[in-house]
Interface confidence: low
C-alpha cells in the first residue's frame, strides 16, 4: 500500500498525523508558544507524496518561525514609538496625542505570543464628529476622515495581513458606527481562550439575567442578545464533523456544546436549542420546532447521541447546508407562528458555528446568512435579534475571511474567533457563562473561571465584625438582608457598633455597611440546657441582619439562592408547582452530599453533609465530648434535627470565626445555601494567627472532628415570618 515518506520533522516543533502515513492523512505541525510553523500542514496524496497547501514546491523544510505583531501603518493626531516594521513577542508600542485630542484606548500595547496586540486600539479624538473617531487598528489603513451622520469609513490591511471585523463602517444616527472594529491579524494568529470567553460571554450574560421574572424593579441591562421577559431565545449549535475533524476533537465539540447547553439552561430564560452536525450534509439532531428542544435532558441526550460516524460517507465541509438548515427551521417556525405575530417577531436567535476549516462545498455560506437576516428582518432597529458566532478551531485550515464574513458585526463586540485547539475551545465554553456581571439580584451566581478572585467565586459571602476584631461570617440572601448565626450576637446588643463587610469590585477590602436591624431567633439560648449538663446548646442558632442600605449588585456582591423560594426554583429549572419538600429531595438527595463553606481567607472548602442513617453515625460521636457535655445520655438533646452534620473522612472543619457562613451546594452552575455554620467539636485554627493556616485533627483525636450546621429546611417558619416580603416562598 502507498504511504508518504516519514522525513517530515520540524526543527524546534512537533507534528501529529490524522490517519498515519496513509494517503488522505493530514500532518499538522505545532511549535512552542511565540513561534509558528511554516508550513502549518501537509496532506498525504494518493501518489504517496506530501503536498503543502499554497506552496510551489511539494516539500519545503518545515521550520518554527518567531511570531510577530503588525506595526501601525498610520496613527492620526498623535505619535507612536518605537517605529518598527513589525514587533516581536513581548515588544511594546506607546501612543501619545497632539494637543486638543484625547487618547481613547490603550496608551501602551504589548505584542502577545499569539501574534495579537493586547489592550484596545488607541485613538486620538477631539469629540468633534457625530460619531466618535473610529480609529485605525494596527496594521490597517483607513480611507474616510469625516465622522458625521451617514459618513462612511473603509479599511484594508497592509500586505499579508487578514482583516477581521467590518471593512466598511457607517456613522449611524445614534452616534454609533455600524459593524464591528476591523482588526488586521497575521494569517497564523489565533485567539487565547481567556480573550474569547469574555467576548463571547458578554453577549450571553445580559441575556441570561434579563428575564428574571422575580425581579421586582425593571433595571436596564443594556444590549447584547437581550431577551425580553416575554421573549424567547433560539440557540442553534452547529458542529463540524467533517473528515479533518478527528473523532477525539468531535467529542470535545460535543462536550463544549453540552457545557454551553447546561449553563444556558441554568438561567431563567425561555430557550430552545437546536443541534446540527454537518460534513457534506447537515444532520438535524434537535430542532427548535421540537418541544423537547426546551428540555435540557432531551437536548443533552440528543447531543450525546451525535455520532462521528454519522457523516462517514460525506467528508467535506458544507457550511452553507448547515446554515441553510437553520434557515429552513426558522422558515418553518415562522409559518407555524405567523410572520406578523409577536410570538415570532420577539424570538431572538443565536447561532454558534464550531468548525475546524473553511467550507469546501455547497456554495457560499454567506448566502445562507443573508437569507437568515432577511427572514428575521434584521435591520438597524432589529440588530439585537440575531447573533452569529463563528468559531474556528485549530490554526490549520481555518479561513479567517470566511469566519469573519459569517460572524455578526456589532459595535464593541466580536463574533468571529480562531482558537488554537479543541482544548482551548473547551476552556472557552467552560468560562464564557460566568455571568457574574449581571446587574439585577439574580441569585446564586458565582464566577467559576480559574482566574476569578475568592470573592467573585462566592459573592454572597460577608464578614460580620464589631469595632475591634472579626467575629462571624454570613451570606447575602437579598440586596439588603444577611443570614448568619445567632450566637454571633450573644455578647451585647449594641448593633450600632457592628459592621458588615460586603464584597466590592472597587476595593479588595470590600465595603462596610451599618446594620439597620438584627433579627435574632428568640429560641436561641446557649445556656438553655445547662441544668441537663449541656454547657452549650445551639438550637435555633440563626439570625437575620438588615443592612442600612441596599447593596449594589456586582461581580463581588450577589445573593445566594435560598431553597424553598421561587428564585431558587427558577435556578433549579423546576416546574412551577414545586414545593419546599421537592427542593429538599433534590438538594439533599444522597446519604453523603458534597457541600462547601468559605474559610477565613476566603477560599472555598469542601465538606460532606451526612443524611439519613449516616447522619446518625455522624452525630453520635458527640457523646464522646465530655468537656462540653459531661453527662450526656441522649445525643439528640444536643444535636437536634435542626442540624446538618459533617466532619467525617477528608472533610475540612470550620474555624471559630467562620460561624454564620453559608453551607452551600452547586447545582446546574448555581449555588444554593442549605445550612449555616453553627458549632463543632474541633477548631482547626486554634492557636494560629495566620488566616491561611489550618491544622487537621490528629487521627487519634477523641472525639473525632464533627461540625454542625443549621439546616435551613428546618427553619422555614422563622425564615418565612421575617423574609415573606423579601423573597417569594414556595409551599412547604
Amino acid at each position: 500500500a502507498t504511504s508518504c515518506p516519514q522525513n517530515v520533522n520540524i526543527s524546534g516543533g512537533t507534528f501529529t498525523l490524522s490517519h498515519g502515513w496513509a494517503p488522505g492523512s493530514l500532518l499538522i505541525y505545532s511549535c512552542p508558544q511565540g513561534l509558528y510553523p511554516s508550513p502549518a500542514s501537509r496532506l498525504c496524496k494518493s501518489s504517496g507524496q506530501w503536498q503543502t497547501p499554497r506552496a510551489t514546491r511539494s516539500l519545503t523544510k518545515a521550520v518554527c518561525k518567531p511570531v510577530r505583531c503588525p506595526a501601525p501603518v498610520s496613527f492620526e493626531n498623535g505619535i507612536y514609538t518605537p517605529r518598527l516594521g513589525s514587533y516581536p513577542v513581548g515588544g511594546n508600542v506607546s501612543f501619545e496625542c497632539e494637543d486638543g485630542f484625547i487618547l481613547r484606548g490603550s496608551p501602551v500595547r504589548q505584542c502577545r505570543p499569539n501574534g495579537m496586540w493586547d489592550g484596545e486600539t488607541a485613538v486620538c479624538d477631539n469629540g468633534a464628529g457625530h460619531c466618535p473617531n473610529p480609529g485605525i487598528s494596527l496594521g490597517a489603513v483607513r480611507t474616510g476622515s469625516r465622522f458625521g451622520h451617514g459618513d462612511k469609513v473603509r479599511y484594508r490591511c497592509s500586505s499579508n495581513l487578514v482583516l477581521t471585523g467590518s471593512a466598511e463602517r457607517e456613522c449611524q444616527g445614534n452616534g454609533v458606527w455600524s459593524g464591528t472594529e476591523p482588526i488586521c491579524r497575521q494569517p497564523y494568529s489565533y485567539d487565547f481562550p481567556e480573550d474569547v470567553a469574555p467576548a463571547l460571554g458578554t453577549s450571553f450574560s445580559h441575556m441570561l439575567g434579563a428575564t428574571n421574572p422575580t425581579q421586582r424593579t425593571k433595571e436596564s441591562l443594556g444590549r447584547k442578545i437581550q431577551i425580553q421577559r416575554s421573549g424567547h431565545l433560539n440557540l442553534y449549535l452547529l458542529l463540524d464533523s467533517s473528515q479533518s475533524v478527528s473523532e477525539n476533537d468531535f467529542l470535545i465539540f460535543k462536550e463544549s456544546a453540552s457545557l454551553m447547553v447546561d449553563r444556558i439552561f441554568s438561567f431563567e430564560i425561555n430557550v430552545s436549542v437546536a443541534i446540527i452536525t454537518f460534513a457534506s450534509e447537515p444532520k438535524v439532531l434537535m430542532s427548535v420546532l421540537n418541544v423537547n428542544s426546551r428540555d435540557i435532558t432531551e437536548v443533552i441526550s440528543s447531543l450525546e447521541n451525535a455520532k462521528y460516524k454519522d457523516h462517514e460517507n460525506g467528508t467535506g465541509t458544507n457550511t452553507y447546508a448547515a446554515l441553510n438548515s437553520v434557515y429552513l427551521m426558522m422558515n418553518n417556525q415562522m409559518q407555524l407562528l405567523g410572520m406578523k405575530t409577536m410570538a415570532w417577531q420577539e424570538i431572538r436567535h443565536a447561532i454558534i458555528l464550531l468548525t475546524d476549516g473553511k467550507s469546501n462545498m455547497g456554495g457560499s455560506p454567506k448566502t445562507a446568512v443573508d437569507q437568515i437576516r432577511e427572514i428575521l428582518n434584521i435591520n438597524q432597529k432589529r440588530n439585537d435579534y440575531l447573533d452569529i458566532y463563528a468559531i474556528g478551531v485549530g490554526k490549520l485550515d481555518v479561513d479567517w475571511r470566511e469566519l469573519n464574513e459569517l460572524g455578526s458585526k456589532k459595535d464593541g463586540e466580536r463574533h468571529a474567533f480562531i482558537l488554537q485547539d479543541t482544548k482551548a475551545l473547551h476552556q472557552v465554553f467552560e468560562h464564557m457563562l460566568d455571568v457574574s456581571k449581571l446587574t439585577d439580584t439574580i441569585c446564586g451566581v458565582g464566577n467559576m473561571s480559574a482566574n476569578a478572585s475568592d470573592q467573585e467565586r462566592t459573592p454572597w459571602h460577608v464578614t460580620i465584625k464589631p469595632k475591634s476584631q472579626e467575629t462571624c461570617r454570613g451570606a447575602l440572601i437579598s440586596d439588603q438582608w444577611v443570614l448568619t448565626a445567632a450566637h454571633c450576637f450573644r455578647d451585647g446588643n449594641d448593633h450600632s457598633l457592628w459592621r458588615v463587610n460586603v464584597g466590592d469590585p472597587k476595593s479588595q477590602w470590600g465595603k462596610e455597611f451599618l446594620i439597620e436591624k438584627a433579627v435574632i431567633s428568640p429560641g436561641f439560648d446557649v445556656f438553655a440546657k445547662k441544668n441537663q449538663g449541656i454547657l452549650e446548646f445551639y438550637g435555633d442558632d440563626i439570625a437575620l441582619l438588615k443592612l442600612a442600605q441596599k447593596v449594589k449588585m456586582s461581580t463581588h456582591a450577589r445573593p445566594i439562592c435560598l431553597p424553598c423560594t421561587m428564585e431558587a426554583n427558577l435556578a433549579l429549572r423546576r416546574p412551577q408547582g414545586s414545593t419546599c419538600r421537592d427542593h429538599e429531595n433534590e438538594l439533599l438527595n444522597k446519604q453523603s452530599v458534597p457541600a462547601h463553606f468559605v474559610a477565613l481567607n476566603g477560599s472555598k472548602l469542601n465538606i460532606n453533609l451526612k443524611m439519613g442513617v449516616e447522619w446518625t453515625s455522624c452525630a453520635e460521636v458527640v457523646s464522646q465530648e465530655k468537656t462540653m457535655f459531661p453527662n450526656l445520655t441522649d445525643v439528640r438533646e444536643v444535636v437536634t434535627d435542626q442540624f446538618l452534620c459533617s466532619g467525617t473522612q477528608e472533610d475540612e472543619s470550620p474555624c471559630k470565626g467562620e460561624s454564620g457562613g453559608a453551607v452551600f451546594l452547586e447545582r446546574r452552575f448555581r449555588f444554593f445555601q442549605v445550612g449555616l455554620v453553627s458549632w463543632g467539636l474541633y477548631n482547626p485554627c486554634l492557636g494560629s494567627a495566620d488566616k491561611n493556616s489550618r491544622k487537621r485533627a490528629p487521627r487519634s483525636k477523641v472525639p473525632p472532628p464533627r461540625d454542625f450546621h443549621i439546616n435551613l429546611f428546618r427553619m422555614q417558619p422563622w425564615l418565612r415570618q421575617h423574609l415573606g416580603d423579601v423573597l417569594n416562598f414556595l409551599p412547604l
Epitope: 484625547i102 468633534a128 451622520h149
Partner: antibody
Framework: QVQLQQSGPGLVKPSQPLSLTCAIS??????????WSWIRQSPSRGLEWLGR?????????DYAVFVKSRMTINPDTSKNQFSLQLNSVTPEDTAVYYC???????????????WGQGILVTVSS | SYELTQPPSLSVSPGQTASITCSGH??????ACWYQQKPGQSPVLVIY???KRPSGIPERFSGSNSGNTATLTISGTQALDEADYYC?????????FGTGTKVTVL
C-alpha cells in the same frame, strides 16, 4: 448648585485685547465630565459659540473657526476659574459675552446647562 | 457651515399651544436642545437631548426631533413664557445656535 460669575471690563478700545474671567462655584474647572465655554450674543449675529476648555488627564482647547487665530481660553485651577482673551478686537466684537458649562458631544451632552450672568462688552474708541 | 433656521416670531394666546420649529440638514440625526431667554437675562436650558426636560422646567415644555426639523412645544402657554427661544445642536467641532424665535403671549 453650579454658579458662574463673570468679571471684566465693559469697554475695550479697538485693536486692544479683551479679557474676561469666569469664576466657578459648585463644580471644578478640572472636572472630568464638564467642558467650559465662552459664547457671545449680538443683535446682528445672534448667539455664537467661541470656544471651550476642558480637562481629561490633560488640558484641551477648541475654538470656533472665525476667532481661532486671536482667541485663547485659559483655565486656572488654583482659583477655579477660566478666562477668555480675544486679541485685536474691532467694533464687530461688540456683544454680550457669556461663560457656560457644557458636556462632551461624545457623551450625548452637546448642550449648556449653566450660564454666567453675561457682560456687555463694547468695542469703541 | 451648518445652519439652524427658526421663524423670527410667533404669537400665541394664553392657554394655547405654541410650536417653535428649528430646521437644519438631517437635524433629526443630531441632538437638539432649546434655551429660553428673557430680556436682560442669560439663556436657560429648557429641553436637551431632543425631548428631555431639566429639573425645574415645567411639564408644559416638550420637544421632538426627526428628519430635518426639531420642534419645541409649549402647551397651555402662560404670560411668563414670553421670551426668545433658541435651538442649538453640535456639528463637527462647533456648537451651532438657531436664529432665535420671539414668542409673544397676546
Amino acid at each position: 448648585q453650579v454658579q458662574l460669575q463673570q468679571s471684566g471690563p465693559g469697554l475695550v478700545k479697538p485693536s486692544q485685547p479683551l479679557s474676561l474671567t469666569c469664576a466657578i462655584s459648585g463644580d471644578s474647572v478640572s472636572s472630568n465630565s464638564a467642558t467650559w465655554s465662552w459664547i457671545r450674543q449680538s443683535p446682528s449675529r445672534g448667539l455664537e459659540w467661541l470656544g471651550r476648555t476642558y480637562y481629561r488627564s490633560k488640558w484641551y482647547h477648541d475654538y470656533a473657526v472665525f476667532v481661532k487665530s486671536r482667541m485663547t481660553i485659559n483655565p486656572d485651577t488654583s482659583k477655579n476659574q477660566f478666562s477668555l482673551q480675544l486679541n485685536s478686537v474691532t467694533p464687530e466684537d461688540t456683544a454680550v459675552y457669556y461663560c457656560a458649562r457644557g458636556g462632551m458631544p461624545a457623551s450625548d451632552i452637546p448642550h449648556f446647562d449653566n450660564w454666567g450672568q453675561g457682560i456687555l462688552v463694547t468695542v469703541s474708541s | 457651515s451648518y445652519e439652524l433656521t427658526q421663524p423670527p416670531s410667533l404669537s400665541v394666546s394664553p392657554g394655547q399651544t405654541a410650536s417653535i420649529t428649528c430646521s437644519g440638514h438631517k437635524l433629526g440625526d443630531k441632538y437638539a436642545c432649546w434655551y429660553q431667554q428673557k430680556p436682560g437675562q442669560s439663556p436657560v436650558l429648557v429641553i436637551y437631548q431632543d425631548n428631555k426636560r431639566p429639573s425645574g422646567i415645567p411639564e408644559r415644555f416638550s420637544g421632538s426631533n426627526s428628519g430635518n426639523t426639531a420642534t419645541l412645544t409649549i402647551s397651555g402657554t402662560q404670560a411668563l413664557d414670553e421670551a426668545d427661544y433658541y435651538c442649538q445642536a453640535w456639528d463637527s467641532i462647533t456648537y451651532v445656535f438657531g436664529t432665535g424665535t420671539k414668542v409673544t403671549v397676546l
